[in-house]
């Protein structure tokens, strides 16, 4: 014969467990009601009375069915390098994530503990691996025939424009300058294309990869008054 539905509090059968959204109270030795998210146990159950729940106070929360005596405190306000992607409510903690241009250098269970600014690749280098929510940008030298003249966390090395007649050859940090006739990229006929001015900072000789087993000798040779900035040359 099926048992009648038991109402909390009730004594579980020997070796039995309490039902969903109930817990076993060791003191009362009874199955008692849990409190819903956003509430906590104000008064614990006895053999004759069920759990009394109360709403969480401001800046505190419970996310799960529970029987905690006090709600959890919401995390501190998001720092200036973070954005609040989830507000503190009675049912959920505040979640802070890194703002655009930053990544999480030290994560916590939810959100981020410490944000750091994404690395910017300097002229002569382009982005090899973009930054993600949890990893920094990686830069690589611009290969022969490509350049980057920016300091950027997103720019990759771009091909030099192809000139019919080259006025100034391109390098890793500067585009080629064309003269006489137009370059392959659309330009006004007969125009001299001058690349955007860029400081000599961080220019380097065109990198040539060394053999993967044993990189060959590479030198940094001065160019003009100052040496190239990030010279990478090989055999």
């Amino acid at each position: 014969e099926p048992r009648a539905v038991a109402f909390t509090p009730y004594a579980p059968e020997p070796g039995g467990t309490c039902r969903l959204r109930e817990y076993y109270d060791q003191t009362a030795q009874m199955c008692c009601s849990k409190c819903p998210p956003g509430q906590h146990a104000k008064v614990f159950c006895t053999k004759t009375s069920d759990t009394v729940c109360d709403s969480c106070e401001d800046s505190t929360y419970t996310q799960l069915w529970n029987w905690v005596p006090e709600c959890l405190s919401c995390g501190s306000r998001c720092s200036s390098d973070q954005v609040e992607t989830q507000a503190c409510t009675r049912e959920q903690n505040r979640i802070c994530t890194c703002r655009p241009g930053w990544y999480c250098a030290l994560s916590k269970q939810e959100g981020c503990r410490l944000c750091a600014q994404l690395r910017k690749c300097r002229p002569g280098f382009g982005v090899a691996r973009p930054g993600t929510e949890t990893s920094d940008v990686v830069c690589k030298p611009c290969a022969p025939g490509t350049f980057s003249n920016t300091t950027s966390s997103t720019d990759i090395c771009r091909p030099h424009q192809i000139c019919h007649v080259v006025a100034i050859p391109g390098n890793a940090s500067m585009d080629a300058v064309c003269t006489s006739t137009s370059p392959t990229r659309s330009m006004a006929p007969g125009a001299v294309h001058l690349p955007q001015p860029v400081s000599t900072r961080s220019q380097h000789t065109q990198p040539t990869p060394a053999p993967s087993t044993a990189p060959g000798t590479s030198f940094l040779l001065p160019v003009g008054p100052s040496p190239p900035a990030e010279g990478s040359t090989g055999d």
Partner: antibody, heavy 125, light 107 residues
Framework: QVQLQQSGPGLVKPSQTLSLTCAIS??????????WNWIRQSPSRGLEWLGR?????????DYTVSVKSRITINPDTSKNQFSLQLNSVTPEDTAVYYC???????????????WGQGTLVTVSS | DIQMTQSPSSLSASVGDRVTITCQAS??????LNWYQQKPGKAPKLLIY???NLETGVPSRFSGSGSGTDFTFTINSLQPEDFATYFC?????????FGQGTRLEIK
């Protein structure tokens, strides 16, 4: 935690080759985000950067001009280490030699964050 | 090569003092400058990167500032463990170069 363990002789005769090795644990010599450097320190010259090797789809080497004709830095992927060879040494090359990991090559936030313990190399007959 | 000139080359101070070290680059290096601490018989240790950013785990009494050619490194309220040699290092251009060091001694 990255650790760099240096090994190699502490005494080299003039005109011979100085050879040091730096074994890496906690990172990979072929990591696409690190670079592997040799730096030396002497009372007369202070801290002096010698060169580096790093991998970004291909291997790259950079060396300082003052030792360009005598230096080779090689990675050894099978042993996860890298080495320094400095040929034709003179007493001027006597120094404490350090290997160091560099984070951020080619970008902002470019620094030496892990160092080997240092090896005093004396060049003397 | 870019020359890095540190001053003073040595200084004496007491626990609790505030000390300042300067580093001057021979040409504009933007903020591509790091500061290291070295104790006798040990390798240098990174303290500050990109002129003013504190490396993780480094006490907040250490700070850095500056841009272009002139940079400053400050220790507020010196602790006994801070007596060491400090170096600046630029990475704007290869070869990477260091300052000659500032030795901080107990007065």
């Amino acid at each position: 935690q990255v650790q760099l363990q240096q090994s190699g002789p502490g005494l080299v005769k003039p005109s011979q080759t100085l050879s040091l090795t730096c074994a890496i644990s906690g990172d990979s010599v072929s990591s696409d985000s690190s670079a592997w450097n040799w730096i030396r320190q002497s009372p007369s010259r202070g801290l002096e950067w010698l060169g580096r090797t790093y991998y970004r789809s291909k291997w790259y080497n950079d060396y300082t001009v003052s030792v360009k004709s005598r230096i080779t830095i090689n990675p050894d992927t099978s042993k996860n280490q890298f080495s320094l060879q400095l040929n034709s040494v003179t007493p001027e090359d006597t120094a404490v030699y350090y290997c160091a990991r560099e984070d951020g090559v080619g970008g902002t936030k470019d620094y030496f964050d892990y160092w080997g313990q240092g090896t005093l190399v004396t060049v003397s007959s | 090569d870019i020359q890095m000139t540190q001053s003073p080359s040595s200084l004496s101070a007491s626990v609790g003092d505030r000390v300042t070290i300067t580093c001057q680059a021979s040409q504009d290096i933007s903020n591509y400058l790091n500061w290291y601490q070295q104790k006798p018989g040990k390798a240098p240790k990174l303290l500050i990167y990109d002129a003013s950013n504190l490396e993780t785990g480094v006490p907040s009494r250490f700070s850095g500032s500056g841009s272009g050619t002139d940079f400053t490194f400050t220790i507020n309220s010196l602790q006994p463990e801070d007596f060491a040699t400090y170096f600046c290092q630029q990475y704007d251009n290869l070869p990477i170069t260091f300052g000659q060091g500032t030795r901080l001694e107990i007065k």
